[in-house]
Interface confidence: low
């Protein structure tokens, strides 16, 4: 169960209530988590995770990735700025979920659990965010445009981008987590 | 930079079997997500894909030619090869090999070698 | 399988903006990638994915797709861009590239 609707959680009335920071720190390790268990069945089916990460480094795909200006990195950090960011970036990356769904056999539901707790991470985050104006939302005929051509793909291209969508997404997550420890 | 060579026979029968080979060097046929072509230009004319062999070994052909060619590699060698069966004169061309990058989601094809012109006639 | 199709040739004036344009197969679903040749060589690949250019290609290609139609653009055309342009996307099953027929352009003054 994604954190956020824990049911245990309202089952202790004991515990302290998680705050804000706590909640999506819990959610993006819980995210992380489901990654994990998506790249463990990916890895498995074919030798894609021994490829050195440099011959996969440069693609097509534009997905989201941290840098220098957008303040997430200690060096420059800008709290305002790297949050917009990291929403931002989670929105540019829900398109890249919905493809990964149908696209794992044993893991399916692993893989609805990351796109729905991913949805929730937003929401999380939208609500820390004071300026929501900075922040820009995917064109939906775009990102239906690339779901068609990225579900046209052959097989070994879509291995290769089911890989490419678990490994940078697990990166901007560690990136963001790390990010906002420091808020 | 990679590179890719043709080698072959420039003159075959009709109804023989047409063997060509492309040699890379600069990269290796087996890196993850790319894919390795032949692509053949008839004399005036435009270009034609023929197939497609990927980094894993998996092959796919051009429906048209399906029937006629193969595609194999030497991993030892970094090459890969065509084989055009039943040839006639239709199928002199300027033949071409051609990686497609991890890099490129579709299927562009970002380095061709030089071409080898093979010619059938008896 | 279903060929793409291309105007067989086109003329520019030296300086203005050139427009080949590709429709067909499974445009509406593959990416579009375009190349240059040039007599007697191998061609080069100048836009890949509809719309991106491989680095030491100049900025006066760009490509763009929209409802089964392909544009590459050449803006401020150059003596040198003289040569056949072809279009190549994949066919409905992901599986076999397609090559359009060509498009021979010539660059006038």
């Known amino acids: 169960v994604p954190p956020g609707e824990d049911s245990k959680d309202v089952a202790a009335p004991h515990r302290q209530p998680l705050t804000s920071s706590e909640r999506i720190d819990k959610q993006i390790r819980y995210i992380l988590d489901g990654i994990s268990a998506l790249r463990k069945e990916t890895c498995n089916k074919s030798n894609m995770c021994e490829s050195s990460k440099e011959a996969l480094a440069e693609n097509n795909l534009n997905l989201p990735k941290m840098a220098e200006k957008d303040g997430c990195f200690q060096s420059g950090f800008n709290e305002e700025t790297c949050l917009v960011k990291i929403i931002t970036g989670l929105l540019e990356f829900e398109v890249y979920l919905e493809y990964l769904q149908n696209r794992f056999e044993s893991s399916e539901e692993q893989a609805r659990a990351v796109q729905m707790s991913t949805k929730v991470l937003i929401q999380f985050l939208q609500k820390k965010a004071k300026n929501l104006d900075a922040i820009t939302t995917p064109d939906p005929t775009t990102n239906a445009s690339l779901l068609t051509k990225l579900q046209a793909q052959n097989q070994w291209l879509q291995d290769m981008t089911t890989h490419l969508i678990l490994r940078s997404f697990k990166e901007f997550l560690q990136s963001s987590l790390r990010a906002l420890r420091q808020m | 930079e990679v590179q890719l060579v043709e080698s072959g026979p420039g003159l075959v029968k009709p109804s023989q079997t047409l063997s060509l080979t492309c040699t890379v060097s600069?990269?290796?046929?087996?890196?993850?997500?790319?894919?390795w072509s032949w692509i053949r230009q008839p004399p005036g004319k435009g270009l034609e894909w023929m197939g497609v062999?990927?980094?894993?070994?998996?092959?796919y052909y051009s429906p048209s030619l399906k029937s006629r060619t193969s595609i194999s590699r030497d991993t030892s060698k970094n090459q890969f090869s065509l084989q055009l069966s039943s040839v006639t004169p239709e199928d002199t061309a300027v033949y071409y090999c051609?990686?497609?990058?991890?890099?490129?989601?579709?299927?562009?094809?970002?380095?061709w070698g030089k071409g080898t012109l093979v010619t059938v006639s008896s | 399988q279903a060929g793409l199709t291309q105007p067989s040739a086109l003329s520019v004036t030296l300086g203005q903006t050139a427009k080949i344009t590709c429709q067909g197969g499974?445009?509406?679903?593959?990416?579009a990638h375009w190349y240059q040749q040039k007599p007697g060589q191998a061609p080069v690949l100048v836009i890949y994915?509809?719309?991106s250019r491989p680095s030491g290609i100049p900025e006066r290609f760009s490509g763009s797709s929209s409802g089964g139609r392909a544009t590459l653009t050449i803006s401020g055309a150059q003596a040198e861009d003289e040569g056949d342009y072809y279009c190549?996307?994949?066919?409905?099953?992901?599986?076999?590239?397609?090559f359009g027929g060509g498009t021979h352009l010539t660059v006038l003054g």
């Open positions: 051609a990686r497609k990058s991890s890099w490129l989601i579709g299927y562009g094809m970002d380095y």
């Open positions: 600069g990269g290796s046929i087996t890196a993850s997500f790319d894919a």
């Open positions: 062999i990927a980094y894993d070994g998996s092959t």
């Open positions: 499974s445009l509406g679903s593959s990416y």
């Open positions: 994915d509809d719309d």
């Open positions: 190549q996307s994949a066919d409905s099953s992901g599986n076999a590239a397609v």
